[in-house]
Amino acid sequence: IWELKKDVYVVELDWYPDAPGEMVVLTCDTPEEDGITWTLDQSSEVLGSGKTLTIQVKEFGDAGQYTCHKGGEVLSHSLLLLHKKEDGIWSTDILKDQKEPKNKTFLRCEAKNYSGRFTCWWLTTISTDLTFSVKSSRGSSDPQGVTCGAATLSAERVRGDNKEYEYSVECQEDSACPAAEESLPIEVMVDAVHKLKYENYTSSFFIRDIIKPDPPKNLQLKPLKNSRQVEVSWEYPDTWSTPHSYFSLTFCVQVQGKSKREKKDRVFTDKTSATVICRKNASISVRAQDRYYSSSWSEWASVPCS
Amino acid sequence: RAVPGGSSPAWTQCQQLSQKLCTLAWSAHPLVGHMDLREEGDEETTNDVPHIQCGDGCDPQGLRDNSQFCLQRIHQGLIFYEKLLGSDIFTGEPSLLPDSPVGQLHASLLGLSQLLQPEGHHWETQQIPSLSPSQPWQRLLLRFKILRSLQAFVAVAARVFAHGAATLSP
């Protein structure tokens, strides 16, 4: 058993049919010695008396808010949550496996630049009685500070018969050094509590590996005289790190016909313009990637050829 | 050419060669994104590699003030990786394919380090750790880790030279 926060405790349980329960001794936080009684949750029934209450925690029915009282007055509370371990593996019932980029990916994180700011998100089908708390650091043995905000519900989607809820959090490294080569990964830890179930999820990454630039901005076409060619131009997204002479992007320009089956013409360039042939009913798209490190491409920015 | 304590390097040449290094490093080990090598307990293996750190002056401001600190750090790293790529980690079993980009990568690391430090001038270099994995699978894992680390190192070096070529070239 360990303390998650003031008056909230997590009991770690091996979860198999003939597992013994965990013996927990609750102590009433009071100088009083006599006339103390204990109750659980909303029930007014007395579970025991005395300054300590020894319980066996085996089921979610044993978790909950234990309260000690004296003469009708509440003295203190202890909320017990359960953390299940099945076959030596901590349960992951609360969050959905996103399976990208690999199985058992519960947290996904992205950064728009090298400023040390990043966003993580996760999915669940649970709609109520759910709380998240996020902590982060650079490195784990001698951790350096990363400040995370509160996790918020960022999207709701219908997936077949189920509703899926996306939560996200923004974090900022306290003393980020955008130009340095990272040697210690960022660690992100999410505590998830659903009703009386506690779970924790972690992710470890370098900012460089989670970079995904915003799409190029101000995508424009300029027809070239007496030609089917057009000059496509664009700019670096506002959110990308500066100066651009240092934090450079490379670009992919694509000409795509109306039909998905049509052959796509692709051009790669480090410049912010390119000359391409514009076919009727086609569209031109441009995306960006860090020039020197192969992290994710941005989403496409597109304009129609007409 | 970079002369210790003195003139500027050939920024444009360094830019071109460092960008080539980036391409080679990724073609030598393109699928790293699908393998989380940090899970494989790399404390004793790649923690000794020289990293370009915050105080090394490789940021735009630091380069403007005095690029020599940064260039020395990059040079150290290039020599370190050049030695690693020439060691039995890469020459031993399992053998690299004949058309593997590792050979070119090795040569380009040497080329860039020589651009930064011509014959007769010496910056102190870092000792390479004695890593001699006994098993082929250990060697393979170590190669992945070294290449992964090299990708991050040459990315910073390439940014330095690109910025230098754009803003510090005479």
């Epitope: 003939d18 013994p20 066996q56 089921e59 979610f60 029915g61 | -």
Partner: antibody, heavy 119, light 107 residues
Framework: EVQLVQSGAEVKKPGESLKISCQSS????????IGWVRQMPGQGLEWIGI????????RYNPMFRGQVTMSVDKSSSTAYLQWSSLKASDTAMYYC????????????WGQGTMVTVSS | DIQMTQSPSSLSASVGDRVTITCKAS??????LAWYQQKPGKAPKSLIY???SRQSGVPSRFSGSGSGTDFTLTISSLQPEDFATYYC?????????FGQGTKLEIK
């Protein structure tokens, strides 16, 4: 006052189905799991299993798994034990009981439902 | 499953006697043991839990002791209403199991 009131005695033929009930009152129904115990004529007590009224989480005695089904209706604070195909060997007194949280033993019991299966 | 063995299976005693019933578990169950009293035609009633804690409303003449594998229920001075069958139950490991019962009769 805590009360667990069980449905009346049943006489059934082999192969028939049956559902007996246990209605709880006088306490917070969702705080306490409900269990069932069998007592065959002239015999001792046998633990069938327990169930959470909150989310229908169930722990069956392996000996009874597949033989009986436990269920619960939160809205009426009622627990159920059912058989899809009774056998003569199911003849017994069945007790529902309230599981004490933080312990696991049964602190309050229903009066019992006698089930007789005979052709 | 954990076997619970009670002894004796039955015993005769008189009002005012001190009576001891023992219960042995086939493996360690800590203090997670309860005692119940059952009278003919009635439901069992909880007497003792956690091996030695008395259920609310149970007279003080009933006491429990023991831990691990050996447990005892003691009635310090038998009363006429105490003649019944007594069961021990372990609630440490699923499935929770009962002893076979001890029938306490009037001598």
């Amino acid at each position: 006052e805590v009360q667990l009131v069980q449905s009346g005695a049943e006489v059934k033929k082999p192969g028939e189905s049956l559902k007996i009930s246990c209605q709880s009152s006088g306490y917070s129904f969702t705080t306490y799991w409900i269990g069932w115990v069998r007592q065959m004529p002239g015999q001792g007590l046998e633990w069938i299993g327990i169930m959470s009224p909150v989310d229908s989480d169930i722990r069956y005695n392996p000996m009874f798994r597949g033989q009986v089904t436990m269920s619960v209706d939160k809205s009426s604070s009622t627990a159920y034990l059912q058989w899809s195909s009774l056998k003569a060997s199911d003849t017994a007194m069945y007790y529902c009981a309230r599981r004490r949280p933080g312990q696991g033993y049964f602190d309050f019991w229903g009066q019992g439902t006698m089930v007789t299966v005979s052709s | 499953d954990i076997q619970m063995t009670q002894s004796p299976s039955s015993l005769s005693a008189s009002v005012g006697d001190r009576v001891t019933i023992t219960c042995k578990a086939s493996q360690n169950v800590g203090s997670w043991l309860a005692w119940y009293q059952q009278k003919p035609g009635k439901a069992p009633k909880s007497l003792i839990y956690s091996a030695s804690s008395r259920q609310s409303g149970v007279p003080s003449r009933f006491s429990g002791s023991g831990s691990g594998t050996d447990f005892t229920l003691t009635i310090s001075s038998l009363q006429p209403e105490d003649f019944a069958t007594y069961y021990c139950q372990q609630y440490d490991i699923y499935p929770f199991t009962f002893g076979q019962g001890t029938k306490l009769e009037i001598k």
